[in-house]
Amino acid sequence: ALDAAYCFRNVQDNCCLRPLYIDFKRDLGWKWIHEPKGYNANFCAGACPYLWSSDTQHTKVLSLYNTINPEASASPCCVSQDLEPLTILYYIGNTPKIEQLSNMIVKSCKCS
Amino acid sequence: ALDAAYCFRNVQDNCCLRPLYIDFKRDLGWKWIHEPKGYNANFCAGACPYLWSSDTQHTKVLSLYNTINPEASASPCCVSQDLEPLTILYYIGNTPKIEQLSNMIVKSCKCS
């Protein structure tokens, strides 16, 4: 799997999980989240050569086509596969609220 | 939806469905498929600015972050959403076989 266990420990220019910290106020301008200050969101990046963690049969077709016709820009792309939620604390007036924001943390990647 | 009905009728630089014909022999080197000779595979391409058909909350976070730090290459990517199978005819010896290859045709796209 193209997850932290593999990607963070290896030199990998191909599609892989990359670490990325997001600060809510600084990076997104979100001042309504009280806790946490930020979180490890991660992201997916890297090349998708033929058969590198291909998501579907179409992805395989496209990556094979792309090797022959690179100028067509019809290549697969490295995107998130498994995502996890993030628990946040915010206030409505003086009332604290705890909520789970779904699909906030990328755990693994794929070529699609 | 970023499908043929919308994308093929509009000039759209952002993420959208793009037409692409694949000839099995010429483009993939697949000589085993007897019929069809090729098919309209289509593909997804284009920019993913903030809130353009965002797949998940993480996609929204990433596209917003990317406006501030484009050099991070941490931007969402335009990928396939809905896919359809393709029915093919091939031979094992002299025996014709009909099979459905799943996820061969892209019908719509998303930013992920």
Partner: antibody, heavy 119, light 107 residues
Framework: QVQLKESGPGLVQPSQTLSLTCTVS????????VHWVRQPPGKGLEWMGL???????RYNSALKSRLSISKDTSKSQVFLRMNSLQTEDTATYYC?????????????WGPGTMVTVSS | DIQMTQSPASLSASLGETVTIECLAS??????LAWYQQKPGKSPQLLIY???SLQDGVPSRFSGSESGPQYSLEINSLQSEDAVTYFC?????????FGSGTKLEIK
């Protein structure tokens, strides 16, 4: 363990180009960002620029026209090139890593390499 | 660029005392502040990040705090090895900027 080490010429002529190498071990350049920071003798620290794990770069606007940062991930090396050097560029040059990309503080530093600009 | 005004430039204190070094940011940096210790001829070492988070392996006598745009580094029970130079750094906006440094001496 995580290590960074700078190397390059100790002496550079004015108007010439400075080339420095930062060789890292214990982590991958496709995972972490690397920054360059310099410190003139007896003075404070100046952030120069960084190279992202994905290869993108960002420079201090005061140095942008003269500065270039690149890397060779397979060799675990980051390179700094700065042209049109003047005596005020005399400094110790450090490479440093941020603990998570976009955290922007530096948890590991190289020992530094002293560069003197003089004729 | 965000200016970081660090004070005092130098400071003298006795062993066992508590000392405070301050940094004033020219604009809101939302707690994105780090503190470093630098020994002569050595590279800086991270002490504190996010204004108050202690870096792994750093003694607990070091602590960080904030009050509006003012950020502080406090060193309790001063020891002889603490007599070096300290820098603050804002990690909020490009270009990342440092304070001018505080040289701490033992009386």
């Amino acid at each position: 363990q995580v290590q960074l080490k700078e190397s390059g010429p100790g002496l550079v002529q004015p108007s010439q180009t400075l080339s420095l190498t930062c060789t890292v071990s214990g982590f991958s350049l496709t995972t972490y960002n690397v920054h360059w920071v310099r410190q003139p003798p007896g003075k404070g620290l100046e952030w120069m620029g960084l190279i992202w794990n994905t290869g993108g770069t960002r420079y201090n606007s005061a140095l942008k026209s003269r500065l270039s940062i690149s890397k060779d991930t397979s060799k675990s090396q980051v390179f700094l090139r700065m042209n049109s050097l003047q005596t005020e560029d005399t400094a110790t040059y450090y490479c440093a890593r941020d603990p998570v990309p976009n955290k922007w503080h530096f948890d590991f530093w190289g020992p530094g390499t002293m560069v003197t600009v003089s004729s | 660029d965000i200016q970081m005004t660090q004070s005092p430039a130098s400071l003298s204190a006795s062993l066992g005392e508590t000392v405070t070094i301050e940094c004033l940011a020219s604009e809101d940096i939302y707690s994105n502040l780090a503190w470093y210790q630098q020994k002569p001829g050595k590279s800086p070492q991270l002490l504190i990040y996010d204004a108050r988070s202690l870096q792994d392996g750093v003694p607990s006598r070091f602590s960080g705090s904030e009050s509006g745009p003012q950020y502080s580094l406090e060193i309790n029970s001063l020891q002889s090895e603490d007599a070096v130079t300290y820098f603050c750094q804002q990690h909020h906006a490009y270009p990342f900027t440092f304070g001018s440094g505080t040289k701490l001496e033992i009386k």
